[in-house]
Interface confidence: medium
C-alpha cells in the first residue's frame, strides 16, 4: 500500500481550456473496433490482395541473442551477419510502408508473411523485387494457365530488380483441407529462379488455405485458433546467392579459407527454425488450454528429414480420424498441420530430435502462460519503487513516481504538457503483462486524463517494439479515460513479455495525466 503523501506545489497556472490534443494521424492506427474498412486489405471481398516485396537484409540466425553460440563461427571474432533476401509485406502497391510484424506474427522470423485464403477465393499478390538480382514469386497452387492469359510464359517467372509483377489465381477445392481435416492447411510460396539457391537465400513463406467461412472478415485470420508456422531446414550459406559477399564480410583479411574444409562448411550451415538457431526464435507465446495450430514445413535435400517433438505436450493430427502423437516425422517438401491444447503452463521446447540437428541448434522455446496468473504488478502497492518509474518530462511537481493507481493528494499523478511524451516502468526483469489500468486526476476544477494511448515495450531498454496485438493496422491504439477518477482496464491480448513498458499518450484532456497499474505475472511463476 502506498502511503498517501500530500506533496505541496508552487502556485500552478490553471488551464480551463478542455481541448483535446491530437499528436498522431488517426489513419496511422487501427483503433480496436472491428472496422474492416481500416484494414490495409479488405477481407470482406473474395479477392485477397497482398503486397509483397523481396527485400535484402542482414541476418544473424539469432546468434547475437543466444548464450550458447560458439563465437568460432565467426572468423572476425564477432557474431557473423549474412545478407539474406526475405519476403516483406507492404501496406499497398506503392511499396513505401512495410507492414511491420506484431506479436502474433513475430514468430515467422525469416519467413514471409502469412497468405491466407478460403476455397473459391481469389488471391492476388503484387510482387515487387527490391533486391539486387532477379527473383520470383511462386507457389505450386498458382495456375499458370491463368498466368499465361496475362502474357507471361509459363515458368519464365523472373522479376528483375525494381520491377513489379502481379500474380492472380483462384483457390481450388483440391488445394483446401478435406472436411475431415483441420480448418486450414499449409502450403508454401517461394522464389523459383533457382529454387535451391533462392530458398537458401531466404525466400519462403507460409500460404494457408482454409474451409469457407473460417477467416474472420475484420482480421483476415481465424481468431478462435492461435497459429504458428515453423519452417525446419538447414540453411546452407554456401548455397546462397550472397555467399561470396557474406564470406568477405565475415572473414577479415588475411582470410585463408579452404572451401573443402569440413569445419568451414559446417560454420556456414545453420540448423534453424524460421531462420533462428539454439532457442532464439521469438514470439511462440500461447495461452494455456487455448487451441493452437502448428504448420510444420520442411524444404531441401534428404538431410532435411526432421523428427519434431514438443516437450511436455502431445499434439493431434487429423486425417480421416484424429490421432494423438508425441513425435512427427517431417519430410522435405511436405507441409503438415497439427493441433495442440497446451494444458501445462511453463516454458517448453520444440525441437528436432535427430541427434545432429538437435546438437546443431534446431530447437526453440515456447511459452504457455496461464490466464489466471494476473495480479497487480505493484504500482499501487508500492512493490514497484519510485526509481523504476521515469518519464520524458513532467509538469511542475506532477512527477512520474506519482503515476500510481488511486494515489491521493493535491498533486497525485504524473502529468506533462510536452507533446510526444511518454512514461516508462522498469519491471527489473521480464514479466508477462496482461493489461493496464489507467486513471486521470483533477486539478482544481479541471479533469486531466489521457483518452488514447499507444504502448511500447522492450526486453533490454534499447530495442523497442510498438504493441500491435489484434490490430490489422501497424499498431494498436488503446482508449483510455473519459474523466479524472474512473478506471479503464485495457487488456493486452496477446500479452506483452517485457522488462520495460512505455505508455505514449496520443490524445488527452488539457495535459497528459496518468495514474496506472500494470496487471501481469512473474515470468517464472
Amino acid at each position: 500500500e502506498i502511503t498517501r503523501t500530500t506533496l505541496q506545489s508552487d502556485q500552478e497556472e490553471i488551464d480551463y481550456d478542455d481541448t483535446i490534443s491530437v499528436e498522431m494521424k488517426k489513419e496511422d492506427f487501427d483503433i480496436y473496433d472491428e472496422d474492416e474498412n481500416q484494414s490495409p486489405r479488405s477481407f470482406q471481398k473474395k479477392t485477397r490482395h497482398y503486397f509483397i516485396a523481396a527485400v535484402e537484409r542482414l541476418w544473424d540466425y539469432g546468434m547475437s541473442s543466444s548464450p550458447h553460440v560458439l563465437r568460432n563461427r565467426a572468423q572476425s571474432g564477432s557474431v557473423p551477419q549474412f545478407k539474406k533476401v526475405v519476403f516483406q509485406e507492404f501496406t499497398d502497391g506503392s511499396f513505401t510502408q512495410p507492414l511491420y510484424r506484431g506479436e502474433l506474427n513475430e514468430h515467422l522470423g525469416l519467413l514471409g508473411p502469412y497468405i491466407r485464403a478460403e476455397v473459391e477465393d481469389n488471391i492476388m499478390v503484387t510482387f515487387r523485387n527490391q533486391a539486387s538480382r532477379p527473383y520470383s514469386f511462386y507457389s505450386s497452387l498458382i495456375s499458370y494457365e491463368e498466368d499465361q492469359r496475362q502474357g507471361a510464359e509459363p515458368r519464365k517467372n523472373f522479376v528483375k530488380p525494381n520491377e513489379t509483377k502481379t500474380y492472380f489465381w483462384k483457390v481450388q477445392h483440391h488445394m483446401a483441407p478435406t472436411k475431415d481435416e483441420f480448418d486450414c492447411k499449409a502450403w508454401a510460396y517461394f522464389s523459383d529462379v533457382d529454387l535451391e539457391k533462392d530458398v537458401h537465400s531466404g525466400l519462403i513463406g507460409p500460404l494457408l488455405v482454409c474451409h469457407t467461412n473460417t477467416l474472420n472478415p475484420a482480421h483476415g485470420r481465424q481468431v478462435t485458433v492461435q497459429e504458428f508456422a515453423l519452417f525446419f531446414t538447414i540453411f546452407d550459406e554456401t548455397k546462397s546467392w550472397y555467399f561470396t559477399e557474406n564470406m568477405e564480410r565475415n572473414c577479415r583479411a588475411p582470410c585463408n579459407i579452404q572451401m573443402e574444409d569440413p569445419t568451414f562448411k559446417e560454420n556456414y550451415r545453420f540448423h534453424a527454425i524460421n531462420g533462428y538457431i539454439m532457442d532464439t526464435l521469438p514470439g511462440l507465446v500461447m495461452a494455456q488450454d487455448q487451441r493452437i495450430r502448428w504448420y510444420l514445413l520442411s524444404m531441401g535435400s534428404n538431410e532435411n528429414i526432421h523428427s519434431i517433438h514438443f516437450s511436455g505436450h502431445v499434439f493431434t493430427v487429423r486425417k480421416k480420424e484424429e490421432y494423438k502423437m508425441a513425435l512427427y516425422n517431417l519430410y522435405p517438401g511436405v507441409f503438415e498441420t497439427v493441433e495442440m491444447l497446451p494444458s501445462k503452463a511453463g516454458i517448453w521446447r520444440v525441437e528436432c530430435l535427430i541427434g545432429e540437428h538437435l546438437h546443431a541448434g534446431m530447437s526453440t522455446l515456447f511459452l504457455v502462460y496461464s490466464n489466471k496468473c494476473q495480479t497487480p504488478l505493484g504500482m499501487a502497492s508500492g512493490h514497484i519503487r519510485d526509481f523504476q518509474i521515469t518519464a520524458s518530462g513532467q509538469y511542475g511537481q506532477w512527477a512520474p513516481k506519482l503515476a500510481r493507481l488511486h494515489y491521493s493528494g493535491s498533486i497525485n499523478a504524473w502529468s506533462t504538457k510536452e507533446p510526444f511524451s511518454w512514461i516508462k516502468v522498469d519491471l527489473l526483469a521480464p514479466m508477462i503483462i496482461h493489461g493496464i489500468k489507467t486513471q486521470g486526476a483533477r486539478q482544481k476544477f479541471s479533469s486531466l486524463y489521457i483518452s488514447q494511448f499507444i504502448i511500447m515495450y522492450s526486453l533490454d531498454g534499447k530495442k523497442w517494439q510498438t504493441y500491435r496485438g489484434n490490430s490489422t493496422g501497424t499498431l494498436m491504439v488503446f482508449f483510455g479515460n473519459v474523466d479524472s477518477s474512473g478506471i479503464k482496464h485495457n487488456i493486452f491480448n496477446p500479452p506483452i513479455i517485457a522488462r520495460y513498458i512505455r505508455l505514449h499518450p496520443t490524445h488527452y484532456s488539457i495535459r497528459s495525466t496518468l495514474r496506472m497499474e500494470l496487471m501481469g505475472c512473474d515470468l517464472n511463476s
Epitope: 502506498i2 502511503t3 503523501t5 506533496l7 505493484g378 502497492s381 508500492g382 512493490h383 519503487r385 519510485d386 526509481f387 523504476q388 512527477a399 513516481k401 506519482l402 500510481r404 522498469d426 527489473l428 526483469a429 521480464p430 531498454g461 512473474d522 515470468l523 517464472n524 511463476s525
Partner: antibody, heavy 126, light 108 residues
C-alpha cells in the same frame, strides 16, 4: 563511508507505539530507498517495508499494513519507522538498511540492502 | 508469498574446507532477484551476493553464488575462521521480500 545510525533500545507496553530513527551519513540520503527489517531473538530476518526519502512513497508487507508508518526528515537525513498497537510478538531488533538499486549502475539488477544500521532492540512487555 | 527454505539448518566444517549452502524457493524466482547475507552474533547482516551470482563490493572471491528457478547455492571455496556465521538467502522480486530461515555455519 556510508553509515546508518539507529536510535537506542526501547521498552514498550502492549498496545503502545514505538518510533525508531535511522540517521544516514556518507551518501545523498534522497538517492536511495530505506528498507526496514526486523529480527526476533534467535529467529530469522523479516522484511517490513521500504520508503523513498525523496518522495515519501512507501510500500509495506501485508502483515504490517495499517499499523506501520514510514516517514523521513530530509533536512536531517533521518528515516523513521513507527509501529503501532504493539504486541509481545513485536519484540525484536529492528534494522534500517540502505537499498541500492543496482540498475543505477547499469547492471540492471533490482535493489538489495547493501548497508545496514546497527539495529535497535524494541522490547514489548507488560 | 514466496517461502525460502535453507538447508542444512546447521553445517559443521573445519577451516580450509568447502561449504555448500542451499536455498530452495516455493516458486520460481528470477535469478536477478536472489541475494545472500552473512550475519555474525550481535551484528547486522552483511550483503555477500546479489543477482544470484554477483559479489557485492569488498566480498572475497572465495564466496560464489549460483542457481536459477527454485534452487540456489552459496559456495565458500575455502573456509576462513571469520566465515563462521549464519547465512540467509533473500528474494526481492515478488512482494513481500522474504528471507530464508538461515544456515548456521559452525566450526567442527
Amino acid at each position: 563511508q556510508v553509515q546508518l545510525l539507529q536510535s537506542a533500545a526501547d521498552v514498550k507496553k502492549p498496545g503502545a507505539s514505538v518510533k525508531v530513527s535511522c540517521t544516514a551519513s556518507g551518501y545523498i540520503f534522497t538517492s536511495y530507498d530505506i528498507d526496514w527489517v526486523r529480527q526476533a531473538t534467535g529467529q530469522g530476518l523479516e522484511w517490513m517495508g521500504w520508503m523513498n526519502p525523496n518522495s515519501g512513497n512507501a510500500g509495506f508487507a501485508q502483515k504490517f499494513k495499517g499499523r506501520l508508518t514510514l516517514t523521513r526528515d530530509t533536512s536531517t537525513s533521518t528515516a523513521y519507522m513507527e509501529l503501532r498497537r504493539l504486541e509481545s510478538e513485536d519484540t525484536a531488533v529492528y534494522y534500517c538498511a540502505r537499498s541500492t538499486p543496482h540498475s543505477y549502475s547499469g547492471s540492471g539488477l533490482p535493489p538489495t540492502s547493501d548497508s545496514w544500521g546497527q539495529g535497535t532492540l524494541v522490547t514489548v512487555s507488560s | 508469498e514466496i517461502v525460502l527454505t535453507q538447508s542444512p539448518g546447521t553445517l559443521s566444517l573445519s577451516p580450509g574446507e568447502r561449504a555448500t549452502l542451499s536455498c530452495r524457493a516455493s516458486q520460481s524466482v528470477s535469478s536477478s532477484f536472489l541475494g545472500w547475507y552473512q550475519q555474525k552474533p550481535g551484528q547486522a547482516p552483511r550483503l555477500l551476493i546479489y543477482g544470484a551470482s554477483s559479489r557485492a563490493t569488498g566480498i572475497p572471491d572465495r564466496f560464489s553464488g549460483s542457481g536459477s528457478g527454485t534452487d540456489f547455492t552459496l559456495t565458500i571455496s575455502r573456509l576462513e575462521p571469520e566465515d563462521f556465521a549464519v547465512y540467509y538467502c533473500q528474494q526481492y522480486g515478488i512482494s513481500p521480500l522474504t528471507f530464508g530461515g538461515g544456515t548456521k555455519l559452525e566450526i567442527k
